[in-house]
Each structure stands twice: as structure tokens, then as C-alpha cells.
């Protein structure tokens, strides 16, 4: 699967259905634009997105976990890796091994403070937004942790 093949509803937000030519948001934007106050720092926006995207990527990868389990035999037959899911693409490279090593370096296998820190930091930044709810859902599901644990326990990185 490619990056664009993700569960889109997790990234979905309500949006105005107005025609852009008569969209009040558009007129407000033009006003702010002409006043020179509209273009805040895109870099800051990207800063806030990076941690969210990483967790979302992990979530997206975890969603393929069941598919891998169902296709376990096929996976064994294709030892060199022919799947195009995010998980197998990720594991085919050295990235997974480096990532796992980074996560478990110097700590117990079930202790992943980075993931918690990322989500908590985002929760603080977006305490009153829907973004925070999305992060809380991720925390509630412990999806990122579960996925990493699953990776380590199955030693799937050693299948290459």
C-alpha cells in the first residue's frame, strides 16, 4: 500500500460546502490577506504536524497488522518480500530495525516514553481542538505501543 492508501476518516474534518466564489471564508481570507496578517508561519504548522503524522503513520501501519496475520503463509513463501503494504515496505528497508533499536535502546521493551511524550505535547498544544480528541483516541487504543510490541514479539524484522 502507498501512503495515500490510508483510512481517510481518521484525518477527516468537517468542511464548508459553500462555493468558493461566494464563500464567506474566502472573503475573510482576502481581507486578512490584503492586510498582510493572514500568512502565519507555515514552518510552525509543519512542526505541529510532524508528531501527529508520525503517530498517524504508525496507526496506518498497524491497521495492516491483521492483513499480515491472515497472509502469514504467503509471507513465509515470499521471504524476499513482495507485499506492497505499508508494513512490509517499511520492514523491507533498514528503517524498521533502526526504529525498533531507537525505541528500545536503554529501556524495557514495554516502555516507550517517546510516543507518550509526543502525544502529550500535542495534547497540550491543541487542548481545545478536535486534533486533541484524535490524539486521545490514539492514546486510548495504545495503537502505537501495541504495534511496536507486536513487531518486537514476532521478530518480524528478522524474517529478511
Amino acid at each position: 500500500r502507498s501512503l495515500q492508501d490510508t483510512e481517510e476518516k481518521s484525518r477527516s474534518f468537517s468542511a464548508s460546502q459553500a462555493d468558493p466564489l461566494s464563500d464567506p471564508d474566502q472573503m475573510n481570507e482576502d481581507k486578512r490577506h490584503s492586510q498582510g496578517t493572514f500568512t502565519s508561519d507555515y514552518s510552525k504548522y509543519l512542526d505541529s504536524r510532524r508528531a501527529q503524522d508520525f503517530v498517524q503513520w504508525l496507526m496506518n501501519t498497524k491497521r495492516n497488522r491483521n492483513n499480515i496475520a491472515k497472509r502469514h503463509d504467503e509471507f513465509e513463501r515470499h521471504a524476499e518480500g513482495t507485499f506492497t503494504s505499508d508494513v512490509s515496505s517499511y520492514l523491507e528497508g533498514q528503517a524498521a530495525k533502526e526504529f525498533i533499536a531507537w525505541l528500545v535502546k536503554g529501556r524495557g521493551r514495554r516502555d516507550f516514553p517517546e510516543e507518550v511524550a509526543i502525544v502529550e505535547e500535542l495534547g497540550r498544544r491543541h487542548a481545545d481542538g478536535s486534533f486533541s480528541d484524535e490524539m486521545n483516541t490514539i492514546l486510548d487504543n495504545l495503537a502505537a505501543r501495541d504495534f511496536i510490541n507486536w513487531l518486537i514479539q514476532t521478530k518480524i524484522t528478522d524474517r529478511k
Epitope: S2, L3, Q4, T6, E8, K9, R11, S12, F13, S14, A15, S16, D25, E29, F38, Y42, S43, Y45, L46, R49, R50, A51, D53, F54, Q56, W57, N60, G93, Q94, A95, E98, F99, W102, E114, A117, I118
Partner: antibody, heavy 119, light 112 residues
Framework: QVQLVESGGGVVQPGRSLRLSCAAS????????MHWVRQAPVKGLEWVAF????????YYADSVKGRFTISRDNSKNTLYLQMNSLTAEDTAVYYC????????????WGQGTLVTVSS | DIVMTQSPDSLAVSLGERATINCKSS????????????LAWYQQKPRQPPKLLIY???IRESGVPDRFSGSGSGADFTLTISSLQAADVAVYYC????????FGQGTKLEIK
Amino acid sequence: QVQLVESGGGVVQPGRSLRLSCAASGFTFSSYGMHWVRQAPVKGLEWVAFISNDKSNKYYADSVKGRFTISRDNSKNTLYLQMNSLTAEDTAVYYCAKESILAALFDSWGQGTLVTVSS
Amino acid sequence: DIVMTQSPDSLAVSLGERATINCKSSQSVLYSSNNKNYLAWYQQKPRQPPKLLIYWASIRESGVPDRFSGSGSGADFTLTISSLQAADVAVYYCQQFYSVPTFGQGTKLEIK
């Protein structure tokens, strides 16, 4: 599969305006941020503008700030770029690009529409 | 903005041989919180739009042949085509997506 089709390009005189459109299909348009990226003849790629999926965040390259406006209509699966006060430096192929799950990473591109600013 | 510089500007390689393209960013694009380098590679064939090949410096996008590989960290990156095929003739661009997106000037790859 993802399809992005740009339209609205053409020849325009300096100082005039043009509006580009990008019709999207094959994915849930309202779930993804969208970008405009341009490529001047025999030149490299330059990011132009970004709009988030819910229209709440819009950003522009310094070179077009104050002249270009990005917008979208999620009910029509369409992205727009309103270009005002055009100059010869704006001559380029304009691509609309779908943002991947990772911000500012472009996983799908349209075929592009050529904008020529000339007197 | 982060400036991306590619080398060489053009490259001629024999079919079946290895092709290597370098990309240097004016500042690090490594995000320490997840140890990922926010660097992507695109391929653009004549009269076509760019196509995403690699993201996070080393992860191949779905459907990209495994002869394409990316490496590097911090501010220095490399795209390698292990065995050049005729279909690989194109211009290759690196792009950082750590900050406001910027591209390298491109490297034109031809067959020797």
C-alpha cells in the same frame, strides 16, 4: 486510483488574472491537504501554496504572497488557485498535488496546466 | 527556507550500471523526536509530472522497484539506482518536507 486534472491555464498579459482549477477523484478529497507546485520552463520545481483539508490553514510561497489565493470546494472535489497581478516570472506549468499522510509530501500529482504571462 | 543542492547536474550511466545522485540540504532535516529524515526523492520523465519514489530518506513508495534506494541522514543524502534500466531515464529531484517544502535543482540521468 487517484486522479488530479488541472485546467484554466493559458496565455495572459502581465498584470492580469487567471484562475486555475484542479478536479480530484479516486480518493476522499475532503480528508487531505492539497498543494499547488509550479515548474518554470527548463527549471526546477517550486512550491506555491497549501490548503488544509478543512480550509483552516492556508500558506503561500513568498514569491506569490498577496497575489495568489488558494481555495477548495470539498463538495465539488475541486481545488482552485486564483492568480492576480501576474508577471512574466509566474510563467510555468502549474501542478496540483495531493499531500500524503505526511505533511508537505506529495504522493500524487496532476498532469499540469501551462500558464504563460506575456505581452 | 532550506536550500537543497543536488550533484551532479547531469549524469550518464551505462545500462545495468549503478547510478548515484547526491543531495545536500542547507540545514539538517532530521527530526530528533522520531529519528526520521524528512527528505523525499521524485522522478520526472519528459512531459510527465513528478512521481514520488522515496520518503523519509530511505522508504520506497509502493510500486517503486527495489533497484531504487535512498540513504543518508542529517543534511547529506543519496539516491542510488543499483542497475540502470532504460525506463529510469528522467530528471530526479530531492525535496525536504521538514519545513516549507523546497526542491533540489534536479539531476538529469541519461544512458551512456
